[in-house]
Interface confidence: low
């Protein structure tokens, strides 16, 4: 039986049930390399409290569809006296990066995971030449996720003092020059995640090989190497390599750009101070507020919720967008789709799409940017579920009683972007990290 998602096969992935202190190791094509779970375990559960291991999915007992992967076991479980078997169930959804398996819940018999990944898309438009896992759990089982930094097109320019060269990098995947052929990047070889531009020439100085690693709680490392044997003539016989160290800052701050800290014989060391290197709970909330000791800030967007069936309306040329954020009020136009953002075609108002649902909500404050994300909307032809990204700006003189109003700024591959100036986006900082 062929592997259902070959792009995900090269790695053992991790997911965590934070509440119960459980670490899962997942290998969807082979078996995880953990002796205590046996030779054929595809999903191994490590109960940290009791220091025990249990296989909750056997690679031999795999069944797959395009969007669901199930691993059964021969272990009985008692679910209201019936003779069920322990199993793991992974639901796959189309995403724009390789993504991460997320633990959803576990019943007595079934361990449920959800995974938004390019591997599950109907079309190949989001697939990279080369991409590696871009998240890691620290020793306290807190997730550090750099997926939001991954560029689907273009690259980051590294800050260095050399006027003759420019070093461009992407995070965890190669630079896609076809989708966004910037003049400097056009010459970059396919597959490169670190591209050195000198004059009109561009050189591959590193490709992703291994996933993100954690070296200390607040320092993550990504290494790129040049796979081909052919040496570059300006590298004094050495093979090029790039090491990017992502550093979680000690207190809240605006974003910075990656900086070159050392360079010798085509070995480039880059340091990037970014809050994306911090653990995810520091950056994100499933509600419309971020506050408390953990986040170092106080943000509350719940006053933006509309009641009584009214919505914010944003004009998108061909479409009108109806938004109702931070609540669970149905948008009247949206046919009980549980939409937080609803897209209606002006020329045919029967064409209604959910562009993100209110129970699929993430509020993120990172590197000075406040973003509210709604995902899980109606599918596009690629299989990607429509989503909306609302970028908030603090404006203490916003109209509409300080609430302001969302403005549609554009769409890229079924992701809809809005900006919203409001007094409720004015962030109050605490100073203790």
């Amino acid at each position: 039986q062929a592997a259902p998602f070959p792009e995900l096969c090269s790695y053992t992935w991790e997911a965590v049930d934070t509440k119960n202190n459980v670490l899962y190791k997942i290998n969807i094509c082979g078996s995880v390399d953990i002796v205590q779970c046996g030779p054929s375990s595809a999903v191994c559960m490590h109960l940290l409290k009791t220091r025990t291991y249990h296989s909750v999915g056997d690679s031999v007992l795999r069944s797959a569809t395009r969007s669901l992967l199930e691993f059964n076991t021969t272990v009985s479980c008692d679910q209201q006296g019936t003779n069920h078997r322990v199993q793991s169930s992974i639901a796959f959804l189309c995403g724009k990066t390789l993504g991460t398996p997320e633990f959803v819940t576990a019943t007595e018999c079934v361990h449920y995971f959800e995974w938004r990944t390019t591997a599950a898309c109907k079309k190949d438009i989001f697939k990279a030449n080369k991409e590696v896992p871009c998240y890691v759990f620290d020793e306290e089982l807190r997730k550090h996720d750099l997926n939001p930094l991954i560029k689907l097109s273009g690259a980051y320019l590294v800050d260095d003092s050399d006027p003759d060269t420019s070093l461009f990098i992407n995070v965890c995947r190669d630079i896609d020059t076809l989708r966004d052929p910037g003049s400097q990047l056009r010459a970059c070889p396919p597959g490169t995640a670190a591209c050195l531009v000198r004059g009109h020439q561009a050189f591959d100085v590193g490709q992703p090989r291994d996933g993100l690693k954690v070296v200390r709680k607040d320092r993550l490392v990504l290494s790129y190497v040049r796979e081909e044997a052919g040496k570059l003539d300006f590298c004094d016989g050495h093979s090029p390599a790039v090491t990017i160290t992502f550093v979680c800052p000690s207190e809240r701050r605006e974003g910075t750009i990656p900086k070159l800290t050392a360079k010798s014989n085509c070995r480039y060391e880059i340091e990037w101070i970014t809050e994306y290197a911090c653990h995810r709970d520091y950056l994100e909330s499933k509600t419309c507020s971020l506050s408390g000791e953990q986040q170092d800030v106080s943000i509350d967007l719940t006053p933006l919720a509309q009641s009584g069936g009214s919505s914010y309306i944003s004009d998108g040329k061909e479409y009108l967008f109806y938004l109702n954020v931070c609540g669970e009020t149905e948008i009247q136009f949206c046919n009980k789709k549980q939409a937080a953002v609803c897209q209606v075609k002006k020329s045919d108002t029967s064409q209604v799409k959910a562009a993100g649902r209110y129970h699929n909500q993430t509020l993120r404050y990172s590197d000075g940017d406040l973003t509210l994300i709604y995902f899980g909307g109606d599918e596009c032809s690629s299989g990607f579920q429509r989503m909306s990204v609302i970028n908030f700006e603090c404006n203490k003189t916003a109209g509409n009683d300080g609430k302001g109003t969302p403005v549609f700024t554009g769409e890229v591959d079924c992701t809809y972007f809005f900006t919203w100036d409001t007094e409720y986006a004015c962030v109050h900082h605490h100073h203790h990290h």
Partner: nanobody
């Protein structure tokens, strides 16, 4: 005393709606994963929906898009909003609290009957 008390069940016509409530006492509600299960006459108890303490919501395929689970931590209550009800949704609905510390706690159940 730790307990869960469900309410809101009753008789409803096909296509109608009901909202079930599950009030918790004696536990730190926000630390618990809350589940709804149901048991139809002569059948085994089946899982319906989960609201993890950190916000994840997940639903059985049979109710996805029709049922919504939510919670009010201030009221120590979890809700199950049930829309577009069908005769096959007829069952006793139970809520369950799971925490890393305590054993699972079950409510006594509330009967939902969908019939014309």
């Amino acid at each position: 005393d730790v307990q869960l008390v469900e309410s809101g069940g009753g008789l409803v016509q096909p296509g109608g709606s009901l909202r079930l409530s599950c009030a918790a006492s004696g536990i730190i509600f926000s630390d618990n994963r809350m589940d709804w299960y149901r048991q139809a006459p002569g059948k085994q108890r089946e899982w319906v929906a989960t609201l993890a303490s950190y916000g994840w919501k997940t639903y059985a395929d049979s109710v996805k898009g029709r049922f919504t689970i939510s919670r009010d931590n201030a009221k120590n209550t979890v809700y199950l909003q049930m829309n577009s009800l069908r005769p096959e949704d007829t069952a006793v609905y139970y809520c369950k609290a799971s925490s890393p510390v305590l054993n699972d706690i079950w409510g006594q159940g509330t009967l939902v009957t969908v019939s014309s």
